[in-house]
Interface confidence: low
């Protein structure tokens, strides 16, 4: 039921031991009570006790005090439960009867006689306060009190609001005095069945199944699920949405793993050589004289530059070199001659010119010959004039450089930028890489050259079933469905056989 009308009998006085008909009880009036509770009537009439009725066992003889008793026979206060909205008004009839029979079940005895009765009509609000009253007639007096209270789990002015406190799957709340729910800490919602996630947990990217939790949806990470997860393998890039790989400055490629500024980041060229951000490894070292190697890390022989002139032979020494001069020459590099034009010192048709009043000479060499005495055939490639891996080729009196792809210029010193042709459409950013240009596309475009306009959001049509999360730009079909537990298929359309053990975790 929704409430209880309680009647506490306190004292009954019938000093002369008289019945209502004027007769006296022998040996005394063995008294029990009948109570009838019904809807309010201005004039109390016989008829059903619409709100309930109850009888007591024999409580005493003639005059007696009624003690409180919480259980068993003779319970006091008397309980009249009801299971409807308490109307706030009532009629109550209390009858005192004498029985010659059974103390415990006097109702069933023949020969019961009425001693007295009282009738109360009026209004009564639900509450814990007892209303106390006393009624007299010529022979008897009855003291009593009464009240209406709500049954367990019922609340409100008329006991019409049901509320059971709970802390389980279906709700986490206590009940307020008016029957409204008061959520336990960490819970919210109409029925307190929605957990309050960890403070700051991202509304869209995180969720929780219990308070102070923050579980990240696919593509998000961090304590508050507010950090996107970049594309798997993304090396030097970041994301603003999941699975993106937006390259840091100086990096390029799908995974931002191609260094566009290797020279600055790594300084690979040694011994004062010059570094260029080009070539098969992303950089090229141009060595100073006396050094060689990919990184100019190898010092050449001191004789490598052929410092000895006039046919002198060069010998390496610890930090230097020494020239052994042929007959007729002297000096550190055999640059001075003891010969004169009279000795015909010029080879290969060279012309001799006297100097210093005939004490020395100089040879004027014909084309393709060089040296103090025109003794050397010119090899125009010995100075390694071709940069960036170009091949040097002697062509008679001249030489040419055959450049590697991507380079040009007399000495292959000019880098042909793949980006010079502006291959990236729609404002894409171009990066020169070993295998050709790479385009970073602006929003709304894709493809190797940003030539594909993304005309619609492939997720807008809701292609994913069963609560799956849709992501765009990750596949040729332009969307990917991330299935919830229990579903598979490209659109999460197929349920998986469910395991028998429950409950599941959300």
């Amino acid at each position: 039921g929704s409430g209880i009308f309680q009647l506490r009998l306190q004292e009954f006085v019938n000093q002369r031991g008289m019945l209502a008909n004027g007769q006296s009880c022998e040996p005394g009036c063995r008294t029990f009570f009948r109570i009838c509770l019904k809807h309010f009537q201005a004039t109390f009439s016989e008829g059903p006790c619409t709100f309930g009725n109850v009888s007591t066992p024999v409580l005493g003889t003639n005059s007696f005090v009624v003690r409180d008793k919480n259980s068993g026979s003779g319970r006091n206060p008397l309980q009249l439960p009801f299971n409807f909205t308490w109307p706030g008004t009532f009629s109550l009839n209390i009858q005192a009867w004498h029985t010659p029979g059974d103390d415990l079940r006097p109702e069933t005895s023949p020969g019961n006689s009425l001693i007295s009765q009282i009738i109360i009509q009026g209004s009564l609000a639900v509450g814990k306060i007892w209303r106390t009253d006393e009624q007299n007639d010529t022979l008897t007096r009855l003291s009593y009190s009464y009240r209406v209270i709500c049954s367990d789990n019922y609340y409100g002015e008329s006991c019409s609001r049901l509320c059971k406190k709970r802390d389980d799957h279906f709700g986490h709340y206590e009940c307020q005095p008016d029957g409204s729910l008061s959520c336990l800490p960490g819970w919210t919602g109409k029925y307190c069945d929605q957990p309050i996630c960890l403070s700051g947990c991202h509304e869209q990217n995180g969720y929780c199944s219990k308070p102070d939790e923050c579980i990240c949806r696919p593509g998000w990470q961090g304590r508050l699920c507010n950090e996107c997860i970049p594309h798997n393998g993304c090396r030097h890039g970041t994301c603003s949405i999941p699975w993106q790989c937006a390259c840091d400055e100086g990096w390029g490629g799908l995974f931002c793993d191609q260094d566009l500024n290797y020279c600055t980041h790594h300084s690979p060229c040694k011994n004062g050589s010059t570094c260029s951000n080009s070539g098969p490894k992303g950089y090229t070292c141009t060595c100073l004289p006396g050094y060689t190697g990919e990184h100019c890390e190898l010092g050449l022989s001191k004789c490598a530059s052929n410092p000895c002139r006039n046919g002198g032979s060069c010998k390496d020494q610890e930090n230097s070199y020494h020239c052994l001069c042929p007959p007729g020459y002297y000096g550190q590099h055999c640059e001075h001659s003891t010969l004169t034009c009279a000795d015909s010192p010029c080879f290969n048709g060279g012309s001799c010119r006297e100097r210093n009043q005939g004490s020395s000479y100089a040879c004027e060499c014909p084309p393709n010959f060089t040296g103090s005495n025109c003794e050397k055939k010119v090899d125009r490639c010995t100075s390694n004039p071709c940069a960036n891996g170009g091949q040097c080729q002697n062509r008679g009196p001249s030489r040419t450089c055959r450049c590697r792809p991507g380079f040009t210029g007399t000495h292959c010193e000019l880098h042909i930028s793949d980006c010079a042709r502006s291959p990236c459409a729609h404002g894409g950013t171009c990066h020169d890489l070993e295998n050709g240009p790479v385009c970073t596309c602006p929003a709304g475009f894709s493809g190797r050259r940003c030539e594909v306009r993304i005309t619609h959001d492939a997720c807008a049509s809701g292609p994913c079933f069963n609560g799956a999360t849709c992501y765009t730009g990750l596949s040729p079909n332009n969307f990917v469905c991330n299935c919830p537990y229990g579903f598979v298929g490209s659109r999460c359309e197929f349920p998986v056989g469910l395991p028998p053990s429950f409950p599941w975790v959300a």
Epitope: H169, Y191, Q194, N466, P484, Y485, G486, V505, A506
Partner: nanobody, 123 residues
Framework: EVQLVESGGGLVQAGGSLRLSCAAS????????MAWYRQAPGKEREYVAA????????YYADSVQSRFTISRDNAKNTVYLQMNSLKPEDTAVYYC????????????????WGQGTQVTVSS
């Protein structure tokens, strides 16, 4: 308006199994919580199991825990109750119910009820 139609009931020996189905039509099924209740003759309607809209969380009455499994197929707008190790005390009319989100999973909070399917377990 949502209509719910239960099927799969019948007579089975104690220890046997049955699979009840509840097909929903009308408004979007996948956004609703679904539940099974039962009512034995002369007894009050009793909660058996419920499942959240995503299918991610299921709840069971103590009396059926580990014997019954509730599941759902949102593509087919159907919820199932797999009943194993049936006992005579499982005999009842089984009702399917559903409710909109953000309400508690209790009998009087369910928006729509089916007509029920009879399950009888003989000993």
């Amino acid at each position: 308006e949502v209509q719910l139609v239960e099927s799969g009931g019948g007579l089975v020996q104690a220890g046997g199994s049955l699979r009840l189905s509840c097909a929903a039509s009308g408004r979007t099924f996948s956004s609703y919580a679904m539940a099974w209740y039962r009512q034995a003759p002369g007894k009050e309607r009793e909660y058996v199991a419920a499942i959240r809209w995503s299918g991610g969380t299921a709840y069971y009455a103590d009396s059926v825990q580990s014997r019954f499994t509730i599941s759902r197929d949102n593509a087919k707008n159907t919820v199932y109750l797999q009943m194993n190790s049936l006992k005579p005390e499982d005999t009842a009319v089984y009702y399917c119910a559903n409710r909109a989100p953000d309400t508690r999973l209790e009998p009087y909070e369910y928006d729509h009820w089916g007509q029920g399917t009879q399950v009888t377990v003989s000993s």
